[in-house]
């Protein structure tokens, strides 16, 4: 049925990166407001973004409670004013979101190269272990804390003077690679979860090159 003068939300879409998770929908409200509910398959519905005029709702606080659960959200449309003055008090219109499992579906954020250090013909490249909004014992967990060995990093590196790229992989946040003495190299990393079927890879990190301030060179 639904209340008079309201339209159901549509195009419900999950936008999630490193577990920061926002539900978006259309249309922009005209004479209506929205309320979002979220639930796990076995749990109770919880209301969020109550009577909002926005078309997005940050659900991070709910999904980080258990990132391996599968969540469903729904967006209710209510007339913009009390029902008696705007229409019949029937069941409100609502639309369901697609299911969302954060652990399997959150996008991997663009990684950052924290540092690199050359010792002779070896270079140690360290990837920043980004903090997420997932908590355990009142502490925010890092991406590595959450994904463990499911998360690997791929390093792309090449001589500044050429375009031929080499790759290395690690299931920690550090690479130790061999380089030619006297050559400057550039580096870029990518986060990967090989076991995933969707959203397997992040975008590449910004390129960092030797001879810039992030690096340290030591002749041994």
């Amino acid at each position: 049925s639904g209340t008079t003068n309201t339209v159901a939300a549509y195009n419900l879409t999950w936008k999630s990166t490193n577990f920061k998770t926002i539900l978006e929908w259309e249309p922009k409200p005209v004479n209506q407001v929205y309320t979002v509910q979220i639930s796990t398959k076995s749990g109770d519905w919880k209301s969020k973004c109550f009577y909002t005029t926005d078309t997005e709702c940050d659900l991070t606080d709910e999904i980080v409670k258990d990132v391996k659960q599968t969540y469903l959200a729904r967006v209710f449309s209510y007339p913009a004013g009390n029902v008696e003055s705007t229409g019949s008090a029937g069941e409100p219109l609502y639309e369901n979101s697609p299911e969302f499992t954060p652990y399997l579906e959150t996008n991997l954020g663009q990684p950052t190269i924290q540092s690199f250090e050359q010792v002779g013909t070896k270079v140690n490249v360290t990837v920043e272990d980004e903090r997420t909004l997932v908590r355990r014992n009142n502490t925010f967990l890092s991406l590595r804390d959450v994904f463990g060995k499911d998360l690997i990093y791929t390093l792309y590196y090449w001589k500044s003077s050429s375009s031929g790229k080499k790759t290395a992989k690690t299931n920690t946040n550090e690479f130790l690679i061999d380089v030619d003495k006297g050559e400057n190299y550039c580096f870029s990393v990518q986060a990967v979860i090989p076991s995933r079927t969707v959203n397997r890879k992040s975008t590449d990190s910004p390129v960092e090159c030797m001879g810039q301030e992030k690096g340290e060179f030591r002749e041994i």
Partner: antibody
Framework: QVQLVESGGGVVQPGRSLRLSCAAS????????MHWVRQAPGKGLEWVAV????????YYADSVEGRFTISRDNSKNTLYLQMNSLRAEDTAVYYC????????????WGQGTLVTVSS | DIVMTQSPDSLAVSLGERATINCKSS????????????LAWYQQKPGQPPKLLIY???TRESGVPDRFSGSGSGTDFTLTISSLQAEDVAVYYC?????????FGGGTKVEIK
């Protein structure tokens, strides 16, 4: 005329429970969102909880989330507030209030019921 | 959460004189799509529940005397009692209904000088 009458207040020990009721008359109860607002002795107003006209959506202040539950029975024209794990800081006059021209604008209030949490 | 800050805490005004109460929100309560400010004013007399005076920042509730007026937009609002009457002695609260949780100002006590 519109009337909202709260009941169920009283003196209760910390950690115990209490259920407040708000009997509504003089308007089509099922058509209006309803709220609980409280006022500690000598203090200002604090919004506590809201329930939509249909009873589907509920929302709470952080200070009561997980301890208080708002509900309604549209067939009985009654609003409820179940208060569990009560604390000294929950001591207040509790008002039920009706959404007016817009959500969260209260055009009618009850007279309030006093809840005292003390050992 | 939107924090509402009222000033002054109390105000003593002579009968027939103007009383002005200010309310500031920590973020805008103006909704650009309809150009409305989601702000209300309430009056509370001792031993009574609050009474709605103004909504949408400047719209008087039905039955409210026209000596009460509201103004302002965005984050700064004012309630004015143009000519204070004895029955206006009360505590006045501003409240935002722009977003949940709903929040009230701390109140301003108006007395007769």
């Amino acid at each position: 005329q519109v009337q909202l009458v709260e009941s169920g207040g009283g003196v209760v020990q910390p950690g115990r429970s209490l259920r407040l009721s708000c009997a509504a008359s003089g308007f089509t109860f099922r058509s209006y969102g309803m709220h609980w607002v409280r006022q500690a002795p000598g203090k200002g107003l604090e919004w506590v909880a809201v329930i939509t006209y249909d009873g589907i959506n509920k929302y709470y202040a952080d200070s009561v989330e997980g301890r208080f539950t708002i509900s309604r029975d549209n067939s009985k024209n009654t609003l409820y507030l179940q208060m569990n794990s009560l604390r000294a800081e929950d001591t207040a006059v509790y008002y039920c209030a009706r959404d007016g021209v817009y959500y969260g604008v209260y055009d009618y209030w009850g007279q309030g019921t006093l809840v005292t949490v003390s050992s | 959460d939107i924090v509402m800050t009222q000033s002054p805490d109390s105000l003593a005004v002579s009968l027939g004189e103007r009383a002005t109460i200010n309310c500031k929100s920590s973020q805008s309560v103006l909704f650009s799509s309809n150009n409305k400010n989601y702000l209300a004013w309430y009056q509370q007399k001792p031993g009574q529940p609050p009474k709605l005076l103004i909504y949408w920042a400047s719209t008087r509730e039905s039955g409210v005397p026209d000596r009460f007026s509201g103004s302002g937009s965005g984050t700064d609002f004012t309630l004015t009692i143009s000519s204070l009457q004895a029955e206006d002695v009360a505590v006045y609260y501003c409240q935002q209904f722009h977003s949940y949780p709903l929040t009230f100002g701390g109140g301003t006590k108006v007395e007769i000088k």
